[in-house]
Amino acid sequence: WELTILHTNDVHSRLEQTSEDSSKCVNASRCMGGVARLFTKVQQIRRAEPNVLLLDAGDQYQGTIWFTVYKGAEVAHFMNALRYDAMALGNHEFDNGVEGLIEPLLKEAKFPILSANIKAKGPLASQISGLYLPYKVLPVGDEVVGIVGYTSKETPFLSNPGTNLVFEDEITALQPEVDKLKTLNVNKIIALGHSGFEMDKLIAQKVRGVDVVVGGHSNTFLYTGNPPSKEVPAGKYPFIVTSDDGRKVPVVQAYAFGKYLGYLKIEFDERGNVISSHGNPILLNSSIPEDPSIKADINKWRIKLDNYSTQELGKTIVYLDGSSQSCRFRECNMGNLICDAMINNNLRHADETFWNHVSMCILNGGGIRSPIDERNNGTITWENLAAVLPFGGTFDLVQLKGSTLKKAFEHSVHRYGQSTGEFLQVGGIHVVYDLSRKPGDRVVKLDVLCTKCRVPSYDPLKMDEVYKVILPNFLANGGDGFQMIKDELLRHDSGDQDINVVSTYISKMKVIYPAVEGRIK
């Protein structure tokens, strides 16, 4: 019996087609992805093949103005239109709190939403009961397939799930649920989830009874043969893991942003064992036409976005200096504003030891693309912010050793004076440079804001200590020459859309007046 698994992950509100780098589509003839194009390909495969499942491995939420405005309603609407068969919860599904998940998505989805390792407690338990499930059995042709979900247990540090959801260890939580599926005589089981490629592989290895793992979170691109675009494969598709009980378990992921549709064909024997697996992600480029009815629906929903982008978010009573003449040479107040917003966006539940889990921000000055003049009645709109942060990036959470941070700050000024983009703006950091010294030895003082304290204060950076830092995904991926960050980071979790972070902060603060205050000397 042959099953075709179509899968997406980390779509991050890319409902419209995008450019090749997943930013806003500029030249339509070269654009990719989007739900209208995805639907064309899905329907083509559904017509051609008998047993097809369309699955999503989480993080549909967060990433463009679509999510900012529609807050998840757009996800339910278009996933319903594409007739997804199941979805696993990702960490970003909790970005607007549990209510922001329940109302727009869990109550509106016409497909099961899954996670076996999220357990509700207290008053939430009855409110959310049955709205997401640990697993679901889906009929496919004349057979049934069990889908069991999982979500990153780091979600409380990456999003806003509140205090009434407990995120358990994935493997510990999955095994009993898979065992229950076995008692129902379900012998074909897919683990669908959002914990990253390393955990996907561990699940394949450790969870008895899982036949296939469909993952997300790490934006992993796997491919067999010559890759069709810019993404470099992290391994073959599918990636085969030998389980502890000796089975060959295919593991797949489909990069991110709806650029590819994962396509995996699995052949099962009559006892539900995987005999063979093959496939590849399908690049959703302009050779695949956009479905006209979905495209028309997108255009209808688009109208509200255009109206939103000109509305006032808040006011500034000072000039927001985002000029390259400032932000690439010295501390600039636009950099301070953005870094403050980045930290504010990552405030999580404090405990008696930590006031917050992260206190530091770094931001390449070259990523700040425009100032905002306060003389327009002080008004700040989404449109203004899109000029400051035009690249559609995210502000991510990484863990770095102090020694890596030191290298990053040396790189920040290694060729100072040439108006290059690597000059770092900061938050929760005090750095002193001596530019008379030779490159690589210019950082003379580097103090960082404590997290394990009740009254935050600045302490000298410790080289061997591991620190959490918020930074643009561009830097986490080694952009602007920050190869040491990419090579030495100990953990990387993708965060919220950059413009959304700053717009939310400005809306919250209502009136802003960021200063230049001696963070960089």
């Epitope: 068969d85 509106e108 016409k110 709205l131 640990p134 679901k136 009929p139 229950k180 129902l184």
Partner: antibody
């Protein structure tokens, strides 16, 4: 709150086909399993079969040759047809959804209020 | 098919009594068992699922236990509104099957 309402003729002649419709309000039909269950007067409950909201079916082997369950998602309805009926098919017919917590049509909640179908000439 | 056998077929009890109904499956069904209450002229109402989980809105005087083949429904302190017929149902394999019912009557 999801509600189910059975409708159809209360009297069917022997050898004819019994046809009932269940209308679902207050929720989507697509993500759940929907069942027909019957109860002859003064007797116990018998599961007839299910349809998944996307169209797959599973029938009780004792009735399989005579049963068809179908779904119309545009109307949020699913239907039962039972052919070649006899007096033994006289029963209250209930439609029911699997409970929200059910992974595979394991238990039923909510139910319709039931409709009595009498097979008689 | 899995046969579900309920006992007793009827029980007479008074308000405040503890009532226990048992259900036996002809083969192991793990914890895939539900209990329903049915009053005359009404549809069955789900009380307990997964052998021991209380359905939302059901009073806590109802409880379920058991796994494998033997299951129990207990009403800790019978109330006037609890006089009804109770059915068990296995959700382990198809066709889904119900017990013959236990009628709880006023003594």
């Amino acid at each position: 709150q999801v509600q189910l309402q059975e409708s159809g003729p209360g009297l069917v002649k022997p050898s004819e086909t019994l046809s009932l419709t269940c209308t679902v309000s207050g929720g989507s039909i697509e993500r759940y399993y929907w069942s027909w269950i019957r109860q002859p007067p003064g007797k116990g409950l018998e599961w007839i079969g299910y349809i998944y909201g996307r169209g797959s079916t599973n029938y009780n082997p004792s009735l399989k040759s005579r049963v068809t369950i179908s779904v119309d998602t545009s109307k949020n309805q699913f239907s039962l047809k039972l052919s070649s009926v006899t007096a033994a098919d006289t029963a209250v017919y209930y439609c029911a959804r699997e409970s929200q917590e059910s992974p595979y049509n394991n238990w039923f909640d909510p139910w319709g209020q039931g409709t009595l179908v009498t097979v008689s000439s | 098919d899995i046969q579900m056998t309920q006992s007793p077929s009827s029980v007479s009890a008074s308000v405040g009594d503890r009532v226990t109904i048992t259900c036996r499956a002809s083969q192991g069904i793990s914890s895939w068992l539900a209990w329903y209450q049915q009053k005359p002229g009404k549809a069955p109402k789900l009380l307990i699922y997964a052998a021991s989980s209380l359905q939302s809105g059901v009073p806590s005087r109802f409880s379920g236990s058991g796994s494998g083949t033997d299951f129990t429904l207990t009403i800790s302190s019978l109330q006037p509104e609890d006089f009804a017929t109770y059915y068990c149902q296995q959700g382990n394999s198809f066709p889904r099957t119900f017990g013959g019912g236990t009628k709880v009557e006023i003594k």
